[in-house]
Interface confidence: low
């Protein structure tokens, strides 16, 4: 707490300005009239205030605003809002995306910090879902944002937003949210064609079903090896050596490179051998030529 | 008014690495609306694209040069840079530092190009 | 990848006359073209990009047309400062993997 004490005469502030850099702290307490830094926050960013003095501002604004601040104050805090707290934001109403871009410009290169995840659920939670605009503007700035989120919350995500969604955006995805995004992203490129479909399908392959990843096969799409690494292992098992041909086209060599992996490893142990041998590529580990294959969903329940 | 200015050595020697800046002027590099990308030119012959960068450092390179191809981004000095290694005389061309939008593929602002010879 | 063919290789044009140049994708690129104009020693610009559209500041006498594989850019009347070489590019690959096709060299006949 700043002790409270006069201000020196002809110290008064009039306006928000650079001479204010020379005010001791105190000085700033007591000549700085609260609602006129309030009316002229969007100044404050460009003088260079310490840390020291950004204290004493923030404070001010708190007494004015013990309820939390009004969006036209929030929207110019620029470098004062590396100050606020996460509590001091749950008090926060924002709905304006201009406001929120701002306060993401601010804390731009930096990891997510408590303070941006709580501005950023209470700017979500009060449109009510994530919308197109609001989503583009979250993973422009935080790529890894939508990987951030819960299952449940992405079930809240409009498929209509999907076409803001980056592939760079869905690295961090693990299987449970890629499951609730891949039927989102098939809704709205569903009016695409096949080649189209596809370039802006792949990143949510993590979460197709196996009767997508056959159809998608019969269209010449082409799969790098990157993307049939992260399918779903159960999705790709029942696939056959003839689907998989045609679903990896001419990077099925590649499979060769993964054979000791997960799903080309377990794949390969359902596979006939003398199917395997007919890539030319070498895969071992098939099923032998002439052993009875049990039905698969009996073979899961045996092993 | 946006500018983009590639700089760097214009002889290299074979086998050595190729380093080139390009500053951008003008405009913000963290703008979250572009990636910054790199396209060379041999004499004589067409273009060819090298790679793009985000300002959040993620890149995309192309097929052919990826093996010897870093591209990165310093935010604060407003420059990305291009590092190919183990140049041949092949890598000998004008190279091009572009801006492409982050939605589209296509190149919508080019720097001037410097020449880049590689040479003993 | 995806090859970019453009053609003729030369086009010897007079003049206020109309041009024609081709470009044809080895592969379907939807309508992710854009065509590029270069003159000597200077670097590329932005003609046409999604096909059809017209970059910023690019005089209505440039069109594009075409999709999937067949793509024409045409040049209605043409001026002086227009004869100089152009280049088409898809950009239809995920992962990015950007071709331009060979350039057609546009010169006054």
């Known amino acids: 707490e700043v002790e409270k004490t006069a201000c020196p005469s002809g110290k008064k502030a009039r306006e928000i300005d650079e001479s204010l850099i020379f005010y001791k702290k105190w000085e700033l307490e007591a000549c700085v009239d609260a609602a006129l830094l309030a009316t002229q926050m969007d100044r404050v960013n460009a003088i260079p205030f310490t840390y020291e003095q950004l204290d004493v501002l923030k404070h001010k604004l708190d007494e004015l605003y013990p309820q939390g601040y009004p969006e036209s104050v929030i929207q110019h805090l620029g470098y004062l809002f590396l100050k606020m707290s996460p509590e001091d934001i749950r008090k926060w109403n924002v709905t304006s995306l201009e406001t929120l871009k701002a306060l993401l410009e601010v804390n731009k290169g930096h990891e997510m910090s408590p303070q941006v995840a709580t501005l950023i659920d209470r700017f979500v939670k009060g449109r009510g879902q994530l919308d197109k605009d609001t989503l583009d503007t979250l993973t422009a700035f935080y790529p890894g944002y939508l990987c951030s989120l819960s299952p449940e919350e992405l079930s809240s995500v409009p498929p209509s937003s999907i076409w803001a969604v980056r592939p760079q955006d869905l690295d961090t995805c693990d299987p449970r949210q890629l499951d609730v995004l891949y039927p989102k992203a098939r809704l709205a490129f569903q009016n695409m064609n096949g080649s189209e479909y596809f370039v802006k399908i792949q990143s949510f392959l993590g979460g197709a079903p196996t009767e997508d990843l056959k159809a998608l096969s019969q269209q010449n799409v082409s799969m790098d090896l990157a993307t049939f690494m992260k399918l779903r292992t159960d999705a790709v098992l029942p696939l056959t050596v003839a689907e998989v041909q045609k679903l990896l086209g001419p990077h099925v060599e590649g499979l060769k490179a993964e054979e000791r992996h997960r799903p080309v490893r377990d794949w390969i142990l359902r596979q006939r051998q003398d199917d395997l041998d007919t890539l030319g590529l070498g895969l071992q580990g098939g099923i032998p030529n002439g052993y009875l294959v049990l039905d698969l969903s009996m073979q899961e329940a045996l092993s | 008014q946006l500018q983009l200015q590639e700089s760097g050595p214009g002889l290299v020697k074979p086998s050595e690495t190729l380093s080139l800046t390009c500053t951008v002027s003008?405009?913000?590099?963290?703008?979250?609306?572009?990636?910054w990308g790199w396209i060379r030119q041999p004499p004589g012959k067409g273009l060819e694209w090298i790679g793009s960068?985000?300002?959040?450092?993620?890149?995309f390179y192309s097929p052919s040069l990826k093996s010897r191809l870093n591209i990165s981004v310093d935010t604060s000095k407003k420059q990305f840079s291009l590092k190919l290694s183990s140049v041949t005389a092949a890598d000998t061309a004008v190279y091009y530092c572009a801006r492409r939008p982050y939605k589209s593929g296509l190149f919508d602002f080019w720097g001037q190009g410097t020449l880049v010879t590689v040479s003993s | 990848e995806i090859v970019m063919t453009q053609s003729p290789a030369t086009l010897s044009v007079s003049p206020g006359e109309r041009a024609t140049l081709s470009c044809r994708a080895s592969q379907s690129v939807s309508s992710n073209l854009a065509w590029y104009l270069q003159k000597p020693g200077q670097a590329p610009r932005l003609l046409i990009y999604?096909?059809?559209t017209r970059a910023t500041g690019i005089p209505a006498r440039f069109s594009g047309s075409g999709s999937g594989t067949e793509f024409t850019l045409t040049i209605s009347s043409l001026q002086s400062e227009d004869f100089a070489v152009y280049y088409c590019q898809q950009y239809n690959t995920w992962p990015p993997e950007y071709t331009f096709g060979q350039g057609t060299k546009l010169e006054i006949k």
């Open positions: 960068v985000y300002y959040s450092g993620s890149a």
């Open positions: 999604g096909t059809s």
């Open positions: 003008g405009g913000s590099i963290s703008s979250s609306s572009y990636y």
